[in-house]
Amino acid sequence: DVERTTCPPEKEVHEIDENLIFYKKRELEACVDAALLAAQMDRVDAIPFTYEQLDVLKHKLDELYPQGYPESVIRHLGHLFLKMSPEDIRKWNVTSLETLKALLKVSKGHEMSAQVATLIDRVVVGRGQLDKDTADTLTAFCPGCLCSLSPERLSSVPPSVIGAVRPQDLDTCGPRQLDVLYPKARLAFQNMSGSEYFVKIRPFLGGAPTEDLKALSQQNVSMDLATFMKLRREAVLPLTVAEVQKLLGPHVEGLKVEEQHSPVRDWILKQRQDDLDTLGLGLQGGIPNGYLILDLSVREALS
């Protein structure tokens, strides 16, 4: 921590301005009043403070607001946001999308996903849910940030918001997040025709259950391999060779390329070699002919 000293009279600070760049760390600590700093936060980002000087200013704000900064300060943090830890951000209550936009702009290009994720979480909590305006702000200023939200937070997304989500916004979503988003997407797009529905639902299919994949296989959707590879392993395993062939259509040949990768590899191991041979792709590793398949999980469930 910065040493406490008294401020020399000639160094007393009456406003936050460029003269402060010449102050040493201990002079800033002694001479800058935290309340003045908070009131004139909008000036700070324009002044060429060093990282060390910013540390002192952050320390001042931390002392003034031990329970977390008010939004009037947060909105004007500028590059001081780059000094905030997820623990700092967790104390905030943010409701304004202007504040969110300002901080997302500052963090643009930086690898600081933990801080950004925490910020977005605080906005969702502050606004009560992930509403359309918040989702639009995220897609505009932070593509992929939607996936930084926990499944619990995503559960507050109304289906009406889903229509604004673009495929690239879901690129970094994990299976648990897609499990939450998929049913919402299904609901949001339920009134669309077959081909239009598939285009819209495709980015969310990583959360689709087996029965929905079976239903899609009856609709000539011609799923691309990239989408197939993102499907849940558990959802793919029960599909028959015929169902996968119908699901992929002309893209079925891609199975050969992905033969060694999950979920294709795991699915192959579950199929009869005879059935795999009907595809004419030379896929190997299926259950040999004449072998009996015992599903022990069914027996356990019955006992």
């Epitope: 060429p48 403070f49 060390e52 930086h110 933990a114 801080q115």
Partner: antibody
């Protein structure tokens, strides 16, 4: 006095990898942000990456994003640059520099990286 | 990205001359500008930060001025050790960018 010493440069084939190191002394390394800046032969300076004092914040210029990784070990007073998928255009002298935000106040002597088949 | 343009690209001068180098930013950068000197085979050396603040240990014949988009580095009386290449650099936004350099050589 502040000293920064780079090492790890050399000749590498296109597509190859190198790891540069920068040993810091004469200041409290863990208090400072650090940057890597490069200079192609006979050309100007190009800032390529920085890392915060704790290592929690990182930035890469687009030309190296996805190929280069900056890291630091505060216990060893060292900064690193892992360079993968190297290209001919990555040939340059690579400098590590102390980053005080308003400027780069101390620089190492540089280490030459040559990417050629 | 903010583009930094220096002029002239080279200047020939004699010892004792007053030399002025300008740097223009493609958008306003406030006073977030630094100047460096680089000699052949050596690393750059910081001269000026925050547009006009002299780095500790740098001779007072070097001075910087300007804000917004237009900046100037002035060497009031050129010394033999000042023949070198000079770079400006903006620190206003990421990525940080440098000017292309101005070479000061002997007339």
């Amino acid at each position: 006095q502040v000293q920064l010493v780079e090492s790890g440069g050399g000749l590498v084939k296109p597509g190859g990898s190198l790891r540069l190191s920068c040993a810091a002394s004469g200041f409290t390394f863990s208090d400072h942000y650090m940057s890597w800046i490069r200079q192609a032969p006979g050309k100007g300076l190009e800032w390529i990456s920085y890392i915060s004092n704790s290592g929690s914040i990182i930035y890469y210029v687009d030309s190296v994003k996805g190929r280069f990784t900056i890291s630091r070990d505060n216990a060893k007073n060292s900064l690193y640059l892992q360079m993968n998928s190297l290209r001919a255009e990555d040939t340059a002298v690579y400098y590590c520099a102390r980053d005080v935000r308003t400027a780069f106040d101390y620089w190492g002597q540089g280490t030459l990286v040559t990417v050629s088949s | 990205d903010i583009q930094m343009t220096q002029s002239p690209s080279s200047v020939s001068a004699s010892v004792g001359d007053r030399v002025t180098i300008t740097c223009r930013a493609s958008q306003s950068i406030g006073s977030w500008l630094a100047w460096y000197q680089q000699k052949p085979g050596k690393a750059p050396n910081l001269l000026i930060y925050a547009a006009s603040s002299l780095q500790s240990g740098v001779p007072s014949r070097f001075s910087g001025s300007g804000s917004g988009t237009d900046f100037t580095l002035t060497i009031s009386s050129l010394q033999p050790e000042d023949f070198a290449t000079y770079y400006c650099q903006q620190a206003n936004s990421f990525p940080r960018t440098f000017g292309q350099g101005t070479k000061v050589d002997i007339k």
